[in-house]
């Protein structure tokens, strides 16, 4: 168990725990104090004791010992009074820290005393060698508990230079692979540096005498270190491994390292000392095996095999941990260790080995674990697990502390919980005690709640209530009890309405650049704070101040200017402080594809066959499958910025071999196309030029025709540059008179035409045009027939006659002309005709001529749209490419037809039952007018009751109709007649009904001179005539508001002029009908006294 922080008021004791101790190995130098450290925590206060070499050691009773008087410390210091006092205290120390709950133990502390280092006295004899031989200068420093550093120097304190030939070994000896006369020195001194004592001692100088020789003999390598052929080493896991090979020989050997058993771990291996030393950092199991050094020179080699075994000091797999336990629990302390060789594990309880304890103890040791069942407070103890092998020792202290604590509920009493219907509520009841208290939940009646399967308890005391219902609202009680006491708290639960999304956003597919609107509606518990937010692919969306990308309002999310990056899942999140619901919709943004990202040309050798392979990376399809790829090219030389399609390939294809034209500078691009259209094109490819070739095509549309009577102009459609197949193209033009079988005349030209001069008029020629370039000629061209220049036709068409079809159409016929007289290609006939005048009277106004062009194979034409009852002049001419020949002429007349419609039919109301009709004759008589036909019928009787009668006077312009109904509207139709019958009708609708009602002056206005005023109005069509009064009334004080007598005026007269007005005076004009005031207006006369007449044409009364 673990005592929670909130569990207050119980002062629990603590078993001892070692907090600080001296290192496992302590080397003491002559001048140093000895400090042994051991500190521990615990309640009650901890007592310390020490052992040395397994025997009780009392620091306080030793001379020169200072013990630290501190409640948590058992450390002490020994101060010496002579240089070898430390020898007396050498040994293995251990500290034990105890209180009433148990004993903790420190690891073994090995104290070693190191004396002042001294080189044993020795007589160093001179070393004599012959030049080229090898030699070893020994160092043999005194032994040391701490690592030391060796240096070789001369008497001037200068380091001996080391290289491939001269090397110091790990053992301190100086090795010469072969000596040179320059090595001859009497002062080779070995210095040993002891960092612990901060002292350097030096060996007696060695005198190396080198005898010169005339013939140095080459010899193959031999190992000076190690001397035998193989050796076995143990390397410790995690530690560095150092292997060394030093060889002699002449010339100086070089060293190589090999690992036959596997690869050399390059990241952890370094070679030092001119390759003589191999250092492997952080040895691991995989480094086990054979390592070989090879010393080589030109005469041979020597080798040494190191067999390395990797072992390891003990290390933890699972270290035992201290724990608190309640009565009755099972305590288990795991002690799992590893090492090589496998370590031996021993257990102690309170520092005493378990073997020495009474046999009736309740613990058992099982697979590296110490187990105690049904623990009681009396089982409280500190255990030690110790593991050792030949490389080291591992120790762990761990306590078993059995406590008895009363039950306590750590959750506050009278807490209110709120949750929504259908959700799960969690009522907390965190209880603690030892033994662990039991927890029970009861309802307001004191009954256990667990009878309802919706209620479920957790091990930590929490009560869960799933599928909450409104009637779960209420008070609940939690009861915690153990063998010492029991306690209760109360919890209030309030169940609220769940938030619901009633209409969520819908998945949609939208086009790039458009906008999308998502809507969301939700219902909330009225007592909770509602919120609707939006998320896009899990990110909260907000309206950004500097951008109008998102618009969020009233459960609406609008995303503007859609781009492909906007695609994803959008969700509406409806939430309160108690619950969150989310409704998700997917947005797919579609549009034309992305650009083809990469374009590569390959198989460029095919350019010689006018082919190349184009490959590309697929474009982004933007959610609409790519239907095709369009491959285009541009020729920067001939048509920069102009792209031509070479073809399209299916959308699942990403390469194609293209058929090209010779000598075109091709730059390619590829565009993906889907149903939304083409995307951006790819980056352009490199430019490739196809080799030149002879033309594969000849010009088309070859023609030969003269532009003069004595020449023939040969023209053709020039080849497009992409068909030139070379930098330039020319044209080989050949011609000869048709049917002669004679030799061809020819000329090579660059322009797309050739003029052949001195030809006879209209002679047929055979013509050929062939493309030619630097590589050769195009294919054999086809023969085309051309003609030399034409002359004006001499043929006159002979008229066969004119047939009158009706009053406005005639059929004209003529005989075909003699083609020999055409002097060229008969292109057709020009027919020209014009009206000379009416048969009624001949006008001398401007004559308008009409033309009809008739094809060469036709010898008749219908002339329509003629005016009836008219005289016409007609001409027919044959024409060719040069122009028209002489005309044949003819005159004809059209018969009478029916007239056009009468002009301007007006209805004038005379009374409730009578109307006056007024009209003008038709513009086109089309014959001799014989009179008019008038028809009329009431409108609402659907054409029944039609009345029709002839007015036989062609000069008639008015007609009075009586006996009309004042309540009906009529349709009036008037037609003019000739002997051919009535013509087009003019139609008007009206009657006396609407028109005889309230008077309407329409657009009425007044203008003034100096002594008169004109009032004018527009009478309404068909308005019955009536009479009314006009009254002019002068305004102003000096005029005294004088009125002129009222004047009687007729509506049909359209205007009225009032004379005898005062100059520069304002007048009001009043209009009355049957004593009823109808209209009022104002006018002002001009300011001079001269009389002016009104404009002509105004009626006065």
């Amino acid at each position: 168990i673990q005592i929670p922080e909130e569990y207050e008021g119980h002062h629990v004791m603590e078993p001892p725990v070692i907090t600080e101790q001296s290192p496992r190995r302590l080397v003491v130098f002559p001048t140093d104090d000895i400090s042994l450290k051991c500190e521990a925590s615990g309640k009650p206060e901890v007592q310390f004791r020490w052992t040395r070499d397994g025997v009780h050691f009392k620091p306080k009773e030793e001379l020169g010992v200072t013990v630290y008087q501190s409640p948590h410390s058992g450390s002490f210091t020994i101060t010496g009074n002579n240089s070898n006092f430390a020898q007396r205290f050498q040994g293995i120390y251990r500290c034990f820290a105890s209180n009433k709950l148990g004993t903790a133990m420190s690891h073994e502390i090995r104290l070693m005393a190191e004396g002042a280092p001294k080189w044993p006295k020795e007589t160093v004899k001179p070393v004599e060698v012959e030049e080229g031989e090898s030699v070893v200068l020994p160092c043999n420093p005194p032994p040391s508990a701490e690592p030391l550093r060796i240096y070789w120097m001369n008497s001037k304190i200068l380091h001996i230079k080391q290289d491939e030939r001269v090397t110091m070994g790990q053992n301190g000896n100086l090795y010469f692979a072969n000596v040179l006369t320059s090595d001859n020195h009497s002062d080779y001194i070995c210095h040993a540096h002891f960092p612990g004592t901060r002292t350097i001692i030096q060996k007696e100088p060695i005198d190396l005498r080198v005898k010169a020789t005339n013939s140095m003999i080459d010899r193959k390598p031999r190992l000076l270190f190690p001397t035998n052929s193989s050796s076995h080493l143990v390397a410790l896991q995690g530690q560095p491994l150092v292997l060394e090979c030093i060889a002699e020989g002449f010339p100086t050997p070089t060293i190589k390292w090999l690992r036959p058993s596997g690869p050399m771990p390059a990241d952890r291996v370094t070679y030092q000392n001119h390759n003589k030393t191999l250092q492997l950092l952080k040895v691991g199991e995989e480094d086990d095996g054979e390592y070989r050094c090879l010393a080589e020179n030109s005469l041979g080699s020597a080798r040494h095999a190191y067999y390395v075994t990797v072992e390891a000091a003990p290390y933890w797999l699972h270290k035992p941990q201290s724990h608190l336990y309640g009565p009755g629990e099972t305590a288990r302390l795991d002690c799992q260790v590893q090492g090589r060789p496998q370590p031996e594990v021993t257990w102690r309880i309170n520092g005493i080995p378990v073997e020495e304890l009474a046999k009736d103890q309740k613990y058992r040791i099982q697979r590296g674990a110490l187990i105690l069942s049904n623990v009681q407070p009396s089982d409280t103890m500190v255990t030690q697990c110790e593991a050792r092998n030949r490389h080291g020792l591992l120790l762990a202290n761990a306590y078993i502390y059995v406590v008895q604590l009363p039950a306590k509920i750590l959750t506050a009493d009278n807490q209110t919980y709120m949750a929504v219907q259908g959700s799960t509520a969690y009522l907390l009841c965190k209880a603690f005690g030892a033994p662990v208290p039991s927890v029970q939940w009861l309802d307001e009646d004191g009954t256990t709640v667990l009878q309802d399967e919706r209620f479920f308890p957790y091990a930590n005391g929490t009560l869960g209530i799933r599928d909450l219902q409104a009637n779960d609202t209420g008070r609940y009680f939690c009861l915690a009890a153990n063998d010492q006491n029991n306690v209760t708290i109360m919890a209030n639960l309030k169940v609220k309405d769940a938030t619901q999304i009633t209409q969520g956003p819908r998945s949609t597919i939208e086009k790039k650049g458009s906008r999308v609107t998502f809507t969301c509606q939700a219902s909330f518990d009225p007592s909770l704070q509602p919120s609707i937010t939006w998320r896009g692919d899990g990110r909260d969306l907000q309206e950004l101040g500097d951008s109008d990308k998102y618009f969020i309002e009233d459960g609406r999310l609008v995303i503007h200017s859609l781009d492909y990056s906007d695609q994803g899942n959008y969700s509406c999140v409806a939430s309160t402080e108690l619950d969150v619901v989310e409704s998700r919709a997917q947005l797919l943004v579609v549009g034309s594809p992305g650009p083809v990202p990469r374009l590569v040309l390959s198989d460029l050798h095919l350019l010689t066959q006018s082919q190349v392979r184009v490959s590309w990376s697929p474009a982004e399809d933007h959610n609409a499958p790519i239907e095709k790829y369009d491959i285009e090219f541009e020729d920067k030389e001939m048509a920069p910025e102009k792209w031509y399609s070479l073809g399209k390939v299916p959308g699942n294809q990403t390469s194609t071999t293209l058929k090209l034209s010779p000598y075109v500078h091709y730059t390619f691009r590829v565009t993906a196309i889907n149903k939304y259209g083409p995307g951006e094109p790819s980056p352009v490819s490199e430019t490739v030029v196809t080799p030149e070739a002879a033309p594969e095509k000849n010009p088309v549309d070859v023609k030969g025709e003269g532009n003069e009577t004595t020449n023939m102009v040969i023209t053709w459609k020039p080849l497009r540059w992409m068909d030139w197949n070379a930098p330039q193209v020319q044209y080989r033009v050949q011609w000869r008179p048709q049917g002669t079988r004679g030799p061809w005349q020819e000329q090579i030209v660059s322009d797309p035409f050739l003029v052949v001069s001195n030809t006879s008029t209209f002679v047929p020629y055979e013509i050929k045009v062939q493309a030619v370039n630097s590589q050769g000629k195009g294919p054999e061209p086809q023969v085309t027939i051309g003609y030399s220049g034409e002359d004006y036709p001499q043929a006159i068409p002979e008229l066969e006659g004119i047939e009158i079809l009706n009053s406005s159409a005639v059929l004209v016929k003529w005989r075909p002309v003699d083609l020999a007289q055409v002097k060229g290609h008969l292109r057709g006939y020009n027919v020209t005709y014009w009206r000379e005048g009416s048969q009624r009277k001949h006008s001398k106004r401007h004559i308008h001529k009409d033309h009809v062009v008739v094809p060469a194979n036709t010898t008749s034409v219908i002339l329509s749209g003629l005016r009836p009852y008219s005289s016409y002049h007609l001409e027919v001419q044959a024409f060719n490419g040069r122009g028209s020949g002489p005309a044949s002429e003819f005159t004809f007349s059209t018969p009478e037809g029916v007239p056009g419609h009468p002009e301007a039919l007006h209805l004038e109301c005379q009374s409730n039952t009578s109307l006056l009709l007024r009209w003008q004759p038709p513009l086109s008589h089309n014959g001799v007018l014989t009179g008019y036909v008038l028809s009329y019928h009431p409108l609402d009787e659907g054409g029944k009751g039609q009345l029709s009668f002839n007015l036989r006077d062609p000069e008639l312009r008015t007609h009075n109709l009586t006996d009309l109904s004042p309540h009906l509207r009529y349709r009036f139709q008037l037609q003019a007649t000739t002997k051919e019958g009535p013509g087009e009708a003019i139609v008007r609708e009206g009657g006396t009904m609407a028109l005889s009602g309230i008077s309407d002056f329409g657009n009425i206005s007044a203008t003034a001179g100096e002594n008169y005023s004109v009032v004018s109005w527009v009478p309404k069509e068909g308005q019955c005539n009536f009479r009314f009064h006009i009254l002019f009334k002068a305004l102003g004080e000096e005029k005294g508001g004088a009125s002129l007598s009222p004047q009687y005026v007729s509506y049909n007269q359209s205007s009225y002029t009032q004379w005898d007005l005062q100059p520069d005076t304002d007048y009001e004009i009043h209009l009355f009908k049957e004593r009823m005031f109808r209209h009022q207006m104002a006018v002002k006369t001009n300011g001079t006294g001269r009389v002016r007449l009104p404009p002509a044409g105004f009626a006065t009364e």
Partner: antibody, heavy 119, light 107 residues
Framework: QVQLVQSGAEVKKPGSSVKVSCKAS????????IQWVRQAPGQGLEWIGY????????DYAQKFQGRVTLTADESTSTAYMELSSLRSEDTAVYYC????????????WGQGTTVTVSS | DIQMTQSPSSLSASVGDRVTITCRAS??????VAWYQQKPGKVPKLLIY???TLHSGVPSRFSGSGSGTDFTLTISSLQPEDVATYFC?????????FGGGTKVEIK
């Protein structure tokens, strides 16, 4: 006349980067692609990649992918080649060359830039 | 990648001699092969393309032949100024690759 002038020799440490420049004159810079080739001491020629100075589109030999960056500055008619994570085997003379109009050949060459990579 | 193997790696000939250098491609490259000349301390110079087309300004004593995988550069009459290293290059496919070079010296 057409000229390609490269930047001076460089000595670099392994792991560092080098940027070589190539200034073009005597022709319209954007009309011709620039290719880069290198020649290790006493060795043959090795193609590195190309750049289109008008669109800045570039492509590289697989061997150099991820280590080489080709760029161009139209305003100064200069192409650049940057090689990163240098190793001793990158010691070479680096050439820029103008691609012939119409075929992937090299019609004009820069004078070469010696890059030495050594610790 | 297409390998271009050139032989010999070096040759020595007298002034006026006919010199032949060969180049073999690891796969069919049609006639998409070029030859370059690199004089000591100078930059390479284009001599021939499409296996046999002489680049403008190149003396006519230089000629090329071959198609598919085997190609030849011939100097009909060796001149002192022809001392150089000659490289072949394929441009049928990317990456563009060069031969190892043939060093031509005068005896």
């Amino acid at each position: 006349q057409v000229q390609l002038v490269q930047s001076g020799a460089e000595v670099k440490k392994p792991g560092s980067s080098v940027k070589v420049s190539c200034k073009a004159s005597g022709y319209t810079f954007t009309n011709y692609w620039i290719q880069w080739v290198r020649q290790a001491p006493g060795q043959g020629l090795e193609w590195i990649g190309y750049i289109n100075p008008s669109t800045y589109y570039s492509d590289y030999a697989q061997k150099f992918q991820g280590r080489v960056t080709l760029t161009a500055d139209e305003s100064t008619s200069t192409a650049y080649m940057e090689l990163s994570s240098l190793r001793s085997e990158d010691t070479a003379v680096y050439y820029c060359a103008r691609r012939q109009f119409g075929l992937p050949l090299f019609d004009y060459w820069g004078q070469g830039t010696t890059v030495t990579v050594s610790s | 990648d297409i390998q271009m193997t050139q032989s010999p790696s070096s040759l020595s000939a007298s002034v006026g001699d006919r010199v032949t250098i060969t180049c073999r491609a690891s796969q069919d490259v049609g006639t998409a092969v070029a030859w370059y000349q690199q004089k000591p301390g100078k930059v390479p110079k284009l001599l021939i393309y499409w296996a046999s087309t002489l680049h403008s300004g190149v003396p006519s004593r230089f000629s090329g032949s071959g198609s598919g995988t085997d190609f030849t550069l011939t100097i009909s009459s060796l001149q002192p100024e022809d001392v150089a290293t000659y490289f072949c290059q394929q441009y049928s496919n990317y990456p563009l690759t060069f031969g190892g070079g043939t060093k031509v010296e005068i005896k």
